[in-house]
Structures are given as structure tokens and as C-alpha cells.
Interface confidence: low
């Protein structure tokens, strides 16, 4: 005859293991008692149980309510045991020694692996600003056993450098994404995805990318100069820019103060009747936490009465 | 076929201890969780605790103070009790099963029991 | 514990319609997400576990989506025995239900 067993057994840190020992013995030939010990190399062998095929099971003290015979209905040649809730040092050698009749004594092995599934956690970088170079955009660790795998996924461009540490039981991974901040980044989904035997399916921490950024201002309305002549009404200038975190917006007047009746709406300036005192060097100021810029226009308000064109300059200073 | 059924008393008093019975038979128990939902009349579903086949339980934290999961293997029995009752956990109670994730893959019929003086 | 808010709690559908179900919970749960079935006086019936498996047994019409917090169930051409409550429960800690979904004939 010969033993049935397997060479690993793999269970989820918490539940049951089945160690299966099984006797294919000839016609006629029965099981005395089965054995289970383990057998951690160097460590000599310590009694789990002993299955008597006239006494029953009996368990050892260092093992007490842990280890019990399969569910009914049970072949007599059938030695397997259930290791209850297994924990993280349950893993090693286990050893099944078979006493048979008329045949003699067998013995097997395997080895049990506990499976300890992590929870990973997602911890960002320093805030983003575009202009920096290669930034941690996020960092992801998972601790477990064996050790998990941590990847990334994402639409954003970037580099990731993993590493890991090795304790007695388990290994931690970290796993770093650097990118290169730009504005066309922000809102973007970074998951990290943690993939290991003991889940059911990978777990997935999803951190959503900002990037502070202020963009060049400019200014819009005097596109048509010929418009801009005394008596007009409801001229405006509109200041663009956009940034993250949203800009403020701030109008002055380089040659002097705003002229009265002149509106600041955020944004927008907004003229009354247009006069030749409106003419001068407007400028628009735009900052958020992270930057400012400045736009500045010439307004030259024309007087239908003279034949001159009118002049405008449009010059930009970060 | 794994079957779960659910017996014990419709009827309960305030202030007493509610005690369920869950029977599993068609299947084992080893690797699996045996838990107990309840649904009160018209309402939605509540999960009370489970106990695995290790033979250790975990509770919802709201109820954790009054819950006690047992189990009795020979039988293949799971039993609930809930003490110090109230009108308020009159309810369908369902046993169910569960593989290591908390998702319940195979319920009993559910039984009602009412806390009325 | 995290909450799970379900919408809506009821919908009127005809058969053959295409029905969405959404759940929404507090905080990322990582998919550990089931979805049930249940009739009058019957106990409730898997469908999805794990936020995209379907339960053995049941028809392809159903099928389960989402990630972090917000999931979906989706029934593609509703049948006369699809008319029941629904209930989303996560399975990421201290299980919780959704309020349920009562989908109702037209």
C-alpha cells in the first residue's frame, strides 16, 4: 500500500485546514492508528494527535479544541485531520505516520502554508505643482503572506519603484508613483491594486490626482479697436486665465486710478459711456495659492471728431 | 443541497431572551460561517452576527452587548440569543451561509418572532 | 460602520425594460459588494458578489458594476419573476444593507 497526501495545503488565515493522509492499502489490510506531528526542520517533532482505529481521536494538550477528525461519514483508512481557524504560526512541516495491518508503518509529509491577506493602504505625496520635476505622486503598502503584489493603474504618465520588508511571518511592499505634474493631470484617477492568493480579487485604493497650476493671463475685448470710441456704451474687458485652485481676479489702472463708474465684476471690467478719460494702461492681476500672473492693455478711446487710428498694445508679464 | 432552517418560539416577552435554533443539514460546515440576518416587518435587512467553523464569532457592534452565537457541531446546530428584548427586534431572523467573504450564498426560510406581553 | 444608500427605493418598469439599480457607500469598500433578490415572505436570493460575479444559477440578464464607493446592479431585459425588492450589502468590515429597491409593474 502507499500514502495519499498532498505536498502543500493552503488555507486563508482564520479557517479550517484539512491535512489529508490516506492509506491505498490492498484487500484486507486496516489501519491500527494514524500519527499527525510537526516536524519544522530543527525544531524535533511536536504530537498534534493520535487517531486510534479502536480508542478514537486523541488530541494533545498544545492542541486542545483545534484539531478534529473530518465530518461522517469516514473511511477507516482515511487518517486526515481539520486544523481549526488556522493562525500565521500554524505554517510548516506536518508528518503523518500510518501503523497498517499486515503491511507496516508508512509515513508522508507536507508542508502547511497560511495565507494572510492584506490591507493595503494609500498614502499621497506632497502636494503637486506643475513646474516641479519627477514628484511621489502617491505611495501604497501592503503587508501579508506571501507578500503581495502592489501594481498601479492609471491613465497618467509615471514611474513606479517598488520595495519590501521581510518579517518573520509576512513581507510589507511599498510601491511609489513619481510623475511629472501637469494641469492635464488633475482629476485623474491613480489606483493601486494589491493582488494576492488569499483574496478573492485584487483590492483597489483609488486616489484622485490635483495639480495646483495658474495659467498665463491675457486680456479680451479690444479686439476691435474701432469700437472703442467716445459715447460707447457697455464696453468691457474679460481677463482669462484659469488655474487650480481657482484664481482670483484684481483690475488697476498703471497711470492712475480706475476712472469713476468703471465696474470690476471678478473677471470682467466693465466701462460706462466711453469718454476720453477712459484711455490709459489697464492691468489684470490673477493669483491663486500657488502662483500669479499679470495682463496689461492699452485703451485708447477714439474721438470720432479726429481722423487718427486708434493705437492698442497688448503685452503680457507673468 | 445545503439547507438551512430556522426553528424557535414566535412569541417572546419584553425583557426576555430571544433563542433561535439554526439546523444545517445537506452539506458541512468546515470552512464556512454560519451568521444571522434579521428583517423587521416591512423593512430592510440586519446583520446580527455569524460564528465560523474555527469557533469564533463576530458581531454587529449595535447589538454586540445582547448577542450570543453558539454552535452545537454533532448536531450540526447554530443557535442565537438575544437577550433583554424589545418591541424593536420583532423581525424575520434568517440563518444563513457564508464562504470566508461575508456574502450569504445559501439563507432559511426565516422565522418570525414577536416581543409582545 | 459604513452606510449604504440605495436609489431608488422604488421603480415602475414594464417587462423587457432595461432596469439600473445604484448603491452608494460611505467609503470605498474595494468591490466587497453583494447584491440579493427577495419576494414576499421568502428569504432574500444572491446575484452578485463581489461587486461583477454572478451567483450560480443565475440568469446573464443580471449583471453587477462599480468600484470604490458607488456600484450598480443592472437587470438588461426585465422579466415578469424579476418583479421583487432588491438590497446592495458590503462585505468590507461590519456588513450593512442598502434600503432596498421595490421594482413594480407598470
Known amino acids: 500500500g502507499e500514502l495519499e497526501t498532498s505536498d502543500v495545503v493552503t488555507v486563508v488565515l482564520g479557517q479550517d485546514a484539512k491535512l489529508p493522509c490516506f492509506y491505498r492499502g490492498d484487500s484486507g489490510e486496516q489501519v491500527g492508528q494514524v500519527a499527525w506531528a510537526r516536524v519544522d526542520a530543527g525544531e524535533g517533532a511536536q504530537e498534534l494527535a493520535l487517531l486510534h482505529s479502536k480508542y478514537g481521536l486523541h488530541v494533545s494538550p498544545a492542541y486542545e479544541g483545534r484539531v478534529e477528525q473530518p465530518p461522517p461519514p469516514r473511511n477507516p483508512l482515511d487518517g486526515s485531520v481539520l486544523l481549526r481557524n488556522a493562525v500565521q504560526a500554524d505554517e510548516g512541516e506536518y508528518e503523518c505516520r500510518v501503523s497498517t495491518f499486515p503491511a507496516g508503518s508508512f509515513q508522508a509529509r507536507l508542508r502547511l502554508r497560511v495565507l494572510v491577506p492584506p490591507l493595503p493602504s494609500l498614502n499621497p505625496g506632497p502636494a503637486l505643482e506643475e513646474g516641479q520635476g519627477l514628484t511621489l505622486a502617491a505611495s501604497c503598502t501592503a503587508e501579508g503572506s506571501p507578500a503581495p503584489s502592489v501594481t498601479w493603474d492609471t491613465e497618467v504618465k509615471g514611474t513606479t519603484s517598488s520595495r519590501s520588508f521581510k518579517h518573520s511571518r509576512s513581507a510589507a511592499v511599498t510601491s511609489e508613483f513619481h510623475l511629472v505634474p501637469s494641469r492635464s493631470m488633475n482629476g485623474q484617477p491613480l489606483t493601486c491594486v494589491v493582488s494576492h492568493p488569499g483574496l478573492l480579487q485584487d483590492q483597489r485604493i483609488t486616489h484622485i490626482l490635483h495639480v495646483s497650476f495658474l495659467a498665463e493671463a491675457s486680456v479680451r475685448g479690444l479686439e476691435d479697436q474701432n469700437l472703442w470710441h467716445i459715447g460707447r456704451e457697455g464696453a468691457m474687458l474679460k481677463c482669462l486665465s484659469e488655474g487650480q485652485p481657482p484664481p482670483s481676479y484684481n483690475w488697476t489702472r498703471l497711470d492712475g486710478p480706475l476712472p469713476s463708474g468703471v465696474r470690476v465684476d471678478g473677471d470682467t471690467l466693465g466701462f460706462p459711456p466711453l469718454t476720453t478719460e477712459h484711455s490709459g494702461i489697464y492691468v489684470c492681476h490673477v493669483s491663486n495659492e500657488f502662483s500669479s500672473r499679470d495682463s496689461q492693455v492699452t485703451v485708447d478711446v477714439l474721438d470720432p471728431q479726429e481722423d487718427s487710428g486708434k493705437q492698442v498694445d497688448l503685452v503680457s508679464a507673468s | 443541497q445545503v439547507q438551512l432552517q430556522e426553528s424557535g418560539p414566535g412569541l417572546v416577552k419584553p425583557s426576555e431572551t430571544l433563542s433561535l435554533t439554526c439546523t444545517v443539514s445537506?452539506?458541512?460546515?468546515?470552512?464556512?460561517?454560519v451568521h444571522w440576518v434579521r428583517q423587521p416587518p416591512g423593512k430592510g435587512l440586519e446583520w446580527i452576527g455569524v460564528?465560523?467553523?474555527?469557533?469564533?464569532?463576530n458581531y454587529n457592534p449595535s447589538l454586540k452587548s445582547r448577542v450570543t452565537i453558539s454552535r452545537d457541531t454533532s448536531k450540526n446546530q447554530v443557535s442565537l440569543k438575544l437577550s433583554s428584548v424589545t418591541a424593536a427586534d420583532t423581525a424575520v431572523y434568517y440563518c444563513?451561509?457564508?464562504?470566508?467573504?461575508?456574502?450569504?450564498?445559501?439563507w432559511g426560510q426565516g422565522t418570525l418572532v414577536t416581543v409582545s406581553s | 460602520d459604513i452606510q449604504m444608500t440605495q436609489s431608488p427605493s422604488s421603480l415602475s418598469a414594464s417587462v423587457g425594460d432595461r432596469v439600473t439599480i445604484t448603491c452608494r457607500a460611505s467609503?470605498?469598500?474595494?468591490?466587497?459588494l453583494a447584491w440579493y433578490q427577495q419576494k414576499p415572505g421568502k428569504a432574500p436570493k444572491l446575484l452578485v458578489y463581489?461587486?461583477?460575479n454572478l451567483a450560480d444559477g443565475v440568469p446573464s440578464r443580471f449583471s453587477g458594476s462599480g468600484s470604490g464607493t458607488d456600484y450598480t446592479l443592472t437587470i438588461s431585459s426585465l422579466q415578469p419573476e424579476d418583479f421583487a425588492t432588491y438590497y446592495c450589502?458590503?462585505?468590507?468590515?461590519?456588513?450593512?444593507f442598502g434600503g432596498g429597491t421595490k421594482v413594480e409593474i407598470k
Open positions: 444563513a451561509r457564508s464562504g470566508k467573504w461575508y456574502y450569504f450564498d445559501y
Open positions: 460564528i465560523w467553523s474555527g469557533g469564533s464569532t
Open positions: 445537506g452539506g458541512s460546515l468546515t470552512n464556512y460561517g
Open positions: 467609503e470605498n469598500i474595494y468591490s466587497n
Open positions: 463581489a461587486a461583477t
Open positions: 450589502q458590503h462585505f468590507w468590515g461590519t456588513p450593512t
